[in-house]
């Protein structure tokens, strides 16, 4: 997260760290007791590595009573996701067992009504991604509030030049932005999950290259079918 600040500890009990061989790889969001939603591209280079999900964490390194690392029983990338596009960049991870819920671990309601968030709406994005252009990784969860950007502006040639479909949304990126390592994390508007940080290699913090988020409402049928 660029231009953000440290989050209040455990105030986002839905927040997950998707880990590869014990190290933070991507963000994720607990959407059901046994399911975490993340980004499909996150597992592209995972190959034979061990994928796990950390829940109830604020610090990645310090012991915390609510922290627990779960093995992944099943990884379900969206069937239409492809390595070279930002489209359909969603991944559902089934935990090896139902998460132990409590004040620091709780699923987040997700948007089912397929309607765009109004431009200018302030949404919260959180993650353990890099906090500066030098690539410094934080130990504790960071967050930032970002205004939603209308799709027409996001599709301008100097922005994302027509790449933003109706299944994607954008948020402003003027020095405050999601960045590498935040992919798969939640964009939360009014206490509801609206978007998931896409995991393309995008320049961060440049206002002409807005952050791109997959609209979960557009994938309600797929999410429901996997969780069923």
């Amino acid at each position: 997260i660029l231009g953000g600040r440290e989050a209040e500890a455990h105030a986002r009990p839905y927040m997950a760290s998707v880990q590869l061989n014990g190290a933070h790889l991507c963000g994720g969001v607990l959407v059901a007791e046994q399911w975490v939603l993340s980004a499909a591209h996150c597992l592209e280079d995972a190959a034979d590595g061990k994928v796990q999900v950390l829940l109830g964490a604020h610090s990645l390194s310090q012991p915390e009573p609510s922290k627990r690392l779960y093995d992944v029983l099943r990884a379900v990338p969206h069937p239409d996701s492809q390595p070279d596009t930002i489209d359909h960049d969603l991944l559902l991870l089934q935990l090896s067992e139902k998460a132990t819920l409590g004040p620091a671990v709780r699923p987040l309601p997700w948007q089912r009504v397929d309607r765009d968030v109004a431009p200018g709406t302030l949404c919260d994005v959180a993650g353990w991604g890099i906090v500066n252009h030098a690539g410094r990784r934080p130990d504790s969860l960071q967050h930032v509030l970002l205004p939603v950007l209308d799709r027409a502006t996001c599709n301008r040639r100097t922005h994302h030049d027509g790449a933003i479909t109706e299944r994607l949304m954008c948020a402003e990126s003027n020095r405050r932005d999601s960045c590498k390592g935040d992919s798969g994390g939640p964009l939360v508007c009014g206490g509801v999950l609206e978007g998931v940080v896409t995991s393309g290699s995008r320049v961060c913090g440049n206002r002409k290259k807005p952050g791109i988020y997959t609209r979960v409402a557009s994938y309600a049928a797929w999410i429901d079918s996997v969780l069923a």
Epitope: P119, D150, R151, A152, T153, N155, R156, R157, T158, H160, D161, G162, A163, I164, T165, E166, V203, N206, K208, K209
Partner: antibody, heavy 116, light 112 residues
Framework: EVQLVESGGGLVQPGGSLRLSCAAS????????MNWVRQAPGKGLEWIGD????????DYNADFKRRFTFSLDTSKSTAYLQMNSLRAEDTAVYYC?????????WGQGTLVTVSS | DIQLTQSPSSLSASVGDRVTITCRSS???????????LEWYQQKPGKAPNLLIY???NRFSGVPSRFSGSGSGTDFTLTISSLQPEDFATYYC?????????FGQGTKVEIK
């Protein structure tokens, strides 16, 4: 299939007004800026300006700012170009073109002739 | 405003010829985001322009590989490696980096 269809062109006297329409189909109208470009007979392409179909924000080439106005009817997925105080040198084919990717999609153009 | 000057204004060539059109801008067209929004369009008589090249050197989908773009800063080139009968048309460069966006005056490619 993305389609842009202009209409409203024709013969108009100097000093007169005309409103051109650009009807869009095959995509979500509010997802892309609409631009207007004109081409005088035997001449090059000239950008008039653009409009954001979500916010209605506009940007005009300074040469056209006083006499030309963009508007929208999102319920009809249509953009409009209102042209006032027309002069002989405004005689041209007028195009609408969607921005994103680049100017990949253009209408067929509508000819405006300003003459007495 | 940024002026784009194309050369030549017209040229005569034969099928199979290699054709090069240059476009020079009055100032740099590198955008503040680091990209260069220099595009090339082909226009045939009575028709709307067609996008060939975007961001200096990227071919738009469906554009034949004989069309290529290059350049940087203020000097740009469109090359047609082996001219085909359907390539006789007028070509325009365009800059989208700075408002107002502008087109070059055009280069007409005619049959020799």
């Amino acid at each position: 299939e993305v389609q842009l269809v202009e209409s409203g062109g024709g013969l108009v006297q100097p000093g007169g007004s005309l409103r051109l329409s650009c009807a869009a189909s095959g995509y979500t109208f509010t997802s892309y800026y609409m631009n207007w470009v004109r081409q005088a007979p035997g001449k090059g392409l000239e950008w008039i300006g653009d409009i954001n179909p979500v916010t209605g924000d506009t940007d005009y080439n300074a040469d056209f700012k006083r006499r030309f106005t963009f508007s929208l009817d999102t319920s009809k997925s249509t953009a409009y170009l209102q042209m006032n105080s027309l002069r002989a040198e405004d005689t041209a084919v007028y195009y609408c073109t969607r921005e994103g990717p680049s100017f990949a999609y253009w209408g067929q153009g509508t000819l405006v002739t300003v003459s007495s | 405003d940024i002026q784009l000057t194309q050369s030549p204004s017209s040229l005569s060539a034969s099928v199979g010829d290699r054709v090069t059109i240059t476009c020079r801008s009055s100032q740099t067209i590198v955008h503040s985001n680091g990209d260069t929004y220099l595009e090339w369009y082909q226009q045939k008589p009575g028709k709307a322009p067609n996008l060939l090249i975007y961001k200096v050197s990227n071919r738009f989908s469906g554009v034949p590989s004989r069309f290529s773009g290059s350049g940087s800063g203020t000097d740009f080139t469109l090359t047609i490696s082996s001219l085909q009968p359907e390539d006789f048309a007028t070509y325009y460069c365009f800059q989208g980096s700075h408002v107002p966006v502008t087109f070059g005056q055009g280069t007409k490619v005619e049959i020799k």
